[in-house]
């Protein structure tokens, strides 16, 4: 004989459990229906009547099947340094994430509690590790043969152009300046003395970290004063 289908509320088998989307009500000692997302339990079940559900009010929500007496309040409106990536609905909480150029310095279960502006690397320093949603930019001094002449949270150190004839040698914060004879590097139309990577990917993606120390690991020519340790602005 097929097992008889039980309708809520019903008493579970001794030692048994309630089915999916049901809960055991201690007072009624019965298996009762949960309320779906977007609703809450308006009236709890009894031995003879099932749970009565009702829709969440404005600015409140339930995300899961539940038997809570009241819906949860949606979080406060997003701050000026945030963007609302998920609106408050009856079924989900508002989610605030940091706007471009910012990262989450203090996260919460969903979204971000506190955003902070991404560090900008000053001239002579480039991005060693780009910022993510939850981590700040890491700057590094531009290693020999490379430079950055910008204050930026995205620009990496780029190699100096190689000249037929050098007018001014490059340094960590300035590209080499070539004389009127064309430099030995492909130039983009209209570009002046900027290195053009062969690879089609953006110059700002996956910057590779420079070696932390040069002695013993270069094919490098010794010249000039030691680099400063820090390379960011506004810290």
């Amino acid at each position: 004989l097929p097992a008889q289908v039980a309708f809520t509320p019903y008493a579970p088998e001794p030692g048994g459990t309630c089915r999916l989307r049901e809960y055991y009500d201690q007072t009624a000692q019965m298996c009762c229906s949960k309320c779906p997302p977007g609703q809450h339990a308006k009236v709890f079940c009894t031995k003879t009547s099932d749970t009565v559900c009702d829709s969440c009010e404005d600015s409140t929500y339930t995300q899961l099947w539940n038997w809570v007496p009241e819906c949860l309040s949606c979080g406060s409106r997003c701050s000026s340094d945030q963007v609302e990536t998920q609106a408050c609905t009856r079924e989900q909480n508002r989610i605030c994430t940091c706007r471009p150029g910012w990262y989450c310095a203090l996260s919460k279960q969903e979204g971000c509690r506190l955003c902070a502006q991404l560090r900008k690397c000053r001239p002579g320093f480039g991005v060693a590790r780009p910022g993510t949603e939850t981590s700040d930019v890491v700057c590094k001094p531009c290693a020999p043969g490379t430079f950055s002449n910008t204050t930026s949270s995205t620009d990496i150190c780029r190699p100096h152009q190689i000249c037929h004839v050098v007018a001014i040698p490059g340094n960590a914060s300035m590209d080499a300046v070539c004389t009127s004879t064309s430099p030995t590097r492909s130039m983009a139309p209209g570009a002046v003395h900027l290195p053009q990577p062969v690879s089609t990917r953006s110059q700002h993606t996956q910057p590779t970290p420079a070696p932390s120390t040069a002695p013993g690991t270069s094919f490098l020519l010794p010249v000039g004063p030691s680099p400063p340790a820090e390379g960011s602005t506004g810290d």
């Epitope: 001094p141 290693a143 020999p144 043969g145 490379t146 190699p159 100096h160 190689i162 000249c163 037929h164 004839v165 050098v166 040698p169 490059g170 340094n171 960590a172 080499a176 030995t184 290195p195 990577p197 062969v198 690879s199 590779t208 970290p209 420079a210 070696p211 120390t213 040069a214 002695p215 013993g216 690991t217 270069s218 094919f219 490098l220 020519l221 010794p222 010249v223 000039g224 004063p225 030691s226 680099p227």
Partner: antibody
Framework: QSLEESGGGLVKPEGSLTLTCAVS?????????ICWARQAPGKGLEWIAC????????AYYASWAKGRLSISKASSTTVTLQMTSLTAADTATYFC????????????????????WGPGTLVTVSS | IEMTQTPSSVSAAVGGTVTINCQSS??????LAWYQQKPGQPPKLLIY???YLTSGVPSRFSGSRSGTEFTLTISDLECDDAATYYC????????????FGGGTEVVVK
């Protein structure tokens, strides 16, 4: 701008030879370093040494070349490579090449991208 | 620093693509150059800092880096590309007796 090597030729084992690299079209100044490399017949390239084109006279060598080969700036237009105790293994075409300099850090330097080369001079060590 | 270049020789038809690899024994960041050498001539600098093309070099040549592995790719192969190609670590160290790779001969059919 160009580089030209001279001084190659036939030399006996244990003999000595001085190669010269003459630059033209640019000045030997702190904007450039001059380096030597060599290539044995049918073989690959081997770096030897580099010297600052400016007034510092700073030079550095491949470990195998230290003591037996000596690079120096002879004038504002020439760099020499003195070679002693030559053996058959030193038989090769010797190239001088130019590296662009960099205003930078004492504990760093400049990457050696050889963007200008001379045609080379052949050194044959044989009895 | 040792530079291990593979393969030692490669053959491809006109219009084809050739890939040459170079492995560095140490982390050299992006300090790597690629040279082209034809018989009886000095080497010619093609690419520096792993992926930057020097002027006059066709964009059919490209370079890339992944950690200590570097790649030179020649696409739309032409007869004039027949040569030996060398990678070079642009880092100096006292242990670097040869900063060049062993070379790869490219034969164009």
């Amino acid at each position: 701008q160009s580089l030209e090597e001279s001084g190659g030729g036939l030399v006996k084992p244990e003999g000595s030879l001085t190669l010269t690299c003459a630059v033209s079209g640019f000045d030997l100044n702190s904007y450039y370093w001059i380096c030597w490399a060599r290539q044995a017949p049918g073989k690959g390239l081997e770096w030897i040494a580099c010297i600052d084109g400016g007034s510092t006279g700073s030079a550095y060598y491949a470990s195998w070349a230290k003591g037996r080969l000596s690079i120096s700036k002879a004038s504002s237009t020439t760099v020499t490579l003195q070679m002693t105790s030559l053996t058959a293994a030193d038989t090769a075409t010797y190239f001088c090449a130019r590296v662009q300099s960099y205003v930078g850090y004492a504990n760093y330097g400049y990457p050696n991208y050889f963007n200008l080369w001379g045609p080379g001079t052949l050194v044959t060590v044989s009895s | 620093i040792e530079m291990t270049q593979t393969p030692s020789s490669v053959s491809a038809a006109v219009g084809g693509t050739v890939t040459i690899n170079c492995q560095s024994s140490e982390d050299i960041d992006s300090y790597l150059a690629w040279y082209q050498q034809k018989p009886g001539q000095p080497p010619k600098l093609l690419i520096y800092h792993a992926s930057y093309l020097t002027s006059g070099v066709p964009s059919r040549f490209s370079g890339s880096r992944s950690g200590t592995e570097f790649t030179l790719t020649i696409s739309d192969l032409e007869c004039d590309d027949a040569a030996t190609y060398y990678c070079q670590s642009a880092y100096y160290s006292s242990s670097a007796d040869n900063t060049f790779g062993g070379g790869t001969e490219v034969v164009v059919k």
